[in-house]
């Protein structure tokens, strides 16, 4: 178990032109607050349990009113840390979402108006117990500077808060009741496996399977406080029958459970049973209601205002999870046709189409001639990945928009002269030749050397 702590240092306009002067409008005072959502491992948008490591909401910051014309000051921030308690192991790699919210304090019907100013997300490596890590993130024109760390709650230690720091040597070496026992690393390794049920707070073992009691505790599992009346003289580690010291503190002594939670000892530590409306290792986290703004990404919160009532977040398109903190990967359904690229804009999808396709979902094939015009009497021909125009005589180019010089290719054979004509070209043949392209020699007897005439054509008819 442990606590993730987030310290916001500053939030304000980022560098560069076009940065906003202030998050507040000139007319209305406002104040900022922050929300953090933590997830283990994976990317911040991964489809896994919502804020599985926990979430926290800051207090509201001081009220700020923009003074027109005045230089933009540092925006006043909420006091204190954002703390996210975690019960299990710290994952080492985690993802975070930090949202900056503005609360406008005008005369709106229904109370203050909230709006999401900025949302930053990232994935980081962090060992528990390490120093504060500093970070700067930009969201649009805003810049957020913050530090964070993860620390273990005693008796947990280590980079994942999974090792329990127990005495491995005699208690005299540790001092009664001292749980992390010693700063020496070898004394804070995973404990020996003592007798099953041996009190982790008041018992220890130097050999596997035994359960020796700290002073002030007795019983086979060291769970029974020794009566002070039987204490005769200070001794070392007590047995069930010898004298004792004043009882050492038990895990539930002083009731570590806040907000009316009841404490019960467990084989490893203690457990708080929290009243409705509270949760956390020590019932220190108050119950979340709609008044706390538990819904991320502009989700609509529905539920009562009293701590006993649950809330439900109605998520905007593109988000899901009990707090609307998970982005839905709608593109995984491959909604864009014909190999189009899908972009999830949050409020909608956008398809970017491959060449030859168009439409909101790339559903239109531009290779067919629908909607395409071939100019100057050309005819559209489908196929081949791009539409093609078969152009009328005298025109060329992709869409038959270019005037073609029909004589450029020297189409008239045997020295015939070419003349451009509105309907194409005309060949004026040299003496002794005939045909549309002057391709046939004329015999002196006047008969032409034509191939066999097709039906309906007499030799000598002009061929076009």
């Amino acid at each position: 178990a442990g606590v993730f702590e987030l310290q916001i240092h500053s939030f304000g306009p980022g560098p560069g032109p076009g940065a906003p002067r202030s998050p507040c409008s000139a007319r209305l005072p406002c104040r900022l607050f922050f929300r953090v959502c933590l997830k283990p491992g994976l990317s911040e948008e991964a489809a896994e349990s919502p804020c599985a490591l926990g979430a926290a909401l800051s207090a509201r910051g001081p009220v700020y009113t923009e003074q027109p014309g005045a230089p933009a000051p540092d925006l006043p921030l909420p006091d204190g840390l954002l703390q996210v308690p975690f019960r299990d192991a710290w994952p080492g790699t985690f993802s975070f979402i930090i949202e900056t919210w503005r609360e406008e304090l005008g005369d709106q019907i229904g109370g203050p108006a909230w709006s999401l100013l900025a949302r930053v997300a990232g994935r980081r490596r962090l060992a528990a117990g390490g120093p504060w890590a500093r970070d700067i993130q930009r969201a649009g024109a805003w810049e957020l500077r913050f530090s964070y760390r993860a620390r273990c709650e005693p008796p947990a230690v280590g980079t994942a808060c999974t090792r329990l720091c127990r005495p491995r040597s005699a208690p005299s070496r540790c001092g009664p009741g001292l749980r992390p026992c010693a700063p020496l690393e070898d004394e804070c390794e995973a404990p020996l496996v003592c007798r099953a049920g041996c009190s982790p707070e008041h018992g220890f073992c130097e050999q596997p399977g035994e359960c020796r009691c700290l002073e002030g505790w007795t019983g086979p599992l060291c769970t029974v406080p020794v009566s002070t009346s039987s204490c005769l003289s200070p001794r070392g580690p007590s047995s069930a029958t010898t004298g004792c010291l004043v009882p050492g503190p038990g895990p539930c002594d002083g009731n570590p459970c806040a907000n009316g939670g009841s404490c019960s000892e467990t084989p490893r530590s203690f457990e708080c049973t929290c009243p409705r409306g509270f949760y956390g290792l020590r019932c220190e986290v108050s119950g979340v209601t709609c008044a706390d703004g538990p819904c991320f990404n502009g989700g609509l919160c529905v539920g009562g205002a009293d701590p006993d009532s649950a809330y439900i977040c109605h998520c905007p398109p593109g988000f899901q999870g009990s707090n609307c903190e998970k982005r839905v990967d709608r593109c995984s359904l491959q909604p864009c046709r014909n190999g189009g690229l899908c972009l999830d804009l949050g409020h909608a999808l956008r398809c970017r189409c491959r060449a030859g396709f168009a439409g909101p979902r790339c559903e239109h094939d531009l290779d067919d001639c629908a909607g395409r015009a071939c100019a100057n009497g050309g005819t559209c021909v489908e196929g081949g990945g791009a539409h093609r125009c078969s152009c009328a005589l005298g025109f060329g180019g992709r869409d038959c928009r270019e005037r073609a010089d029909p004589c450029a290719a020297r189409p008239c054979a045997h020295g015939g002269r070419c003349y451009a004509h509105f309907s194409g070209l005309v060949c004026a043949c040299a003496p002794g030749y005939m045909g549309a392209r002057c391709e046939f020699p004329v015999h002196p007897d006047g008969a032409s050397a034509l191939p066999a005439a097709p039906p309906g054509l007499r030799p000598g008819d002009p061929q076009r």
Epitope: P316, P317, L345, R350, R352, P360, R361, L366
Partner: antibody, heavy 128, light 112 residues
């Protein structure tokens, strides 16, 4: 016929605030984003912000965040609120429609990425 | 954000001639390009979207082509009514999650 009409422009002092209104008629307001584009004299259009009518999602240019706020005020009108006006904001402000398309059974709308209907514009002059 | 660069800034051609306007995007936008025509005192008018799809009512003298980062608008058989400024426009979606629109600087077409 389909129409957009802007109003609210005029001569304003530097530092002042202004609210422009765009009224739509002749088409279904839903499944469209209503956008604001401005054009300074002699310059090209510059996109400011849009609001998607189905769910009220607003998105704006990075330079416009903080000073320009787009809102849907009725089933046929959107507004653009501008604060801290300077001479650089002098321009004709256009309201433009960016169509979104929905398909039966599909959970999402699809953005078109272009503006297929524009209003005539309203001129905003910032000068002392 | 994406940057759209148009060339030339101005072009002059005779009636019946052909004009070609180029638009370059700073990143791959696939076919996500629109062209607009704007005359003085009027709002822009959508001519074409998806790089090559003509808007209803726009004459087939206007044609568009291109893909990725390089796009072209061609106006053939120029008419006096084609004298205007032409803008290209695309939408963008940045990795930070912001969606928006960008216009080119414009090309003025003068018809002699």
């Amino acid at each position: 016929q389909e129409q957009l009409v802007e109003s609210g422009g005029g001569l304003v002092q530097p530092g002042a605030s202004l609210t422009l209104t765009c009224k739509a008629s002749g088409f279904d307001f839903t499944s469209n984003a209503m956008c604001w584009v401005r054009q300074a004299p002699g310059k090209g259009p510059e996109w400011i912000a849009c609001i998607y009518n189905d769910d009220g999602s607003a998105y704006s240019a990075s330079w416009a965040k903080g000073r320009f706020t787009v809102s849907k005020t009725s089933s046929t009108a959107v507004t653009l609120q501008v604060t801290g006006l300077t001479a650089a904001d002098t321009a004709t402000y256009f309201c433009a429609r960016s169509p979104y398309y929905t398909y039966g059974g599909a959970p999402s709308a699809y953005a078109s990425g272009y503006f297929n209907l524009w209003g005539p514009g309203t001129l905003v002059t910032v000068s002392s | 954000d994406i940057v759209m660069t148009q060339t030339p800034a101005s072009v002059e051609a005779a009636v019946g001639g052909t004009v070609t306007i180029k638009c370059q995007a700073s990143e791959n936008i696939y076919n996500s390009l629109a062209w607009y025509q704007q005359k003085p005192g009027q709002p822009p008018k959508l001519l074409m979207h998806d790089a090559s799809v003509l808007t209803s009512g726009v004459p087939s003298r206007f044609s568009g082509s291109g893909y990725g980062t390089e796009f072209t608008l061609t106006i053939s058989d120029l008419e006096c009514a084609d004298a205007a400024t032409y803008y290209c426009q695309s939408d963008y979606y940045s990795t930070g999650g912001s969606y928006g629109f960008a216009f080119g600087g414009g090309t003025e077409v003068v018809v002699k």
